[in-house]
Amino acid sequence: SCNTATCVTHRLAGLLSRSGGVVKDNFVPTNVGSEAF
């Protein structure tokens, strides 16, 4: 799985979209490691 910063950002955006934005406040690209996916 791609773990570049851009991949992580797009994956997180998809996750936020699917969850309706209901995630922890610190669930942002620069805080989330690739292990979260």
């Epitope: 791609c2 991949c7 797009h10 942002v28 690209p29 620069t30």
Partner: antibody, heavy 119, light 107 residues
């Protein structure tokens, strides 16, 4: 409104250094990676590197490793790209860019900073 | 580094034409490809991410497809404001790399 505003044009002599700034507003600066890209006249875009403003962690294009330094000032929501040992081939427009999710999911770019290296 | 080879390097087209630009990666990049539009003297503008997803505000006439090594940007009906240079980019591996660009000119 998300904005990335870069510093003004620079003219440098070969061997000198240049430091370009990118002031972010309209979003939480530390939440998103900042990329730096350059474009020499008539050439393709070239990625320099990225920085995590939250941790200061960086990834560099090996082509620029040792000459390019990416830093941030979190309190000023500003990213910096310093390039040392300048040569004529470094004459280019330098851009900062960041993919933001909130408030708007988009890839925002600065307006560009022209760096001219000439003796 | 992954090489991104774009073709054609330039093309002439008329308003209303369907335009297709291709980009070939030197190795598998999954769907981790973006497309940008750039006009002279301006910063690039992002159009497509993850090979086929349009950013908000990008007109529906722009579409992207592909995976692995072969990617396509299609403009279904060229508009006057679409005359520009288009670049692909892979972000699957560091360093990110761009194609050489395709200049879309008025016929």
């Amino acid at each position: 409104e998300v904005q990335l505003v870069q510093s003004g044009a620079e003219v440098k002599k070969p061997g000198a250094s240049v430091k370009v700034s990118c002031k972010a507003s309209g979003y939480t600066f530390t939440d998103y990676y900042m990329n730096w890209v350059r474009q020499a006249p008539g050439q393709r875009l070239e990625w320099i590197g990225d920085i995590n403003p939250n941790t200061g962690g960086t990834n560099y294009n090996q082509k620029f490793k040792g000459r390019a330094t990416l830093t941030v000032d979190k309190s000023a929501s500003t990213a910096y790209m310093e390039l040392s040992s300048l040569r004529s081939e470094d004459t280019a427009v330098y851009y900062c860019a960041s993919i933001i999710i909130v408030p708007n999911y988009f890839d925002y770019w600065g307006q560009g900073t022209t760096v001219t290296v000439s003796s | 580094d992954i090489q991104m080879t774009q073709s054609p390097s330039s093309l002439s087209a008329s308003v209303g034409d369907r335009v297709t630009i291709t980009c070939k990666a030197s190795q598998n990049v999954d769907t981790n490809v973006a497309w940008f539009q750039q006009k002279p003297g301006k910063a690039p503008k992002s159009l497509i991410y993850s090979a086929s997803y349009r950013y908000s505000g990008v007109p529906s006439r722009f579409s992207g497809s592909g995976s692995g090594t072969d990617f396509t940007l299609t403009i279904s009906s060229l508009q006057p404001e679409d005359f520009a240079t288009y670049y692909c980019q892979q972000y699957n591996n560091y360093p990110y790399t761009f194609g050489g660009g395709t200049k879309v000119e008025i016929k």
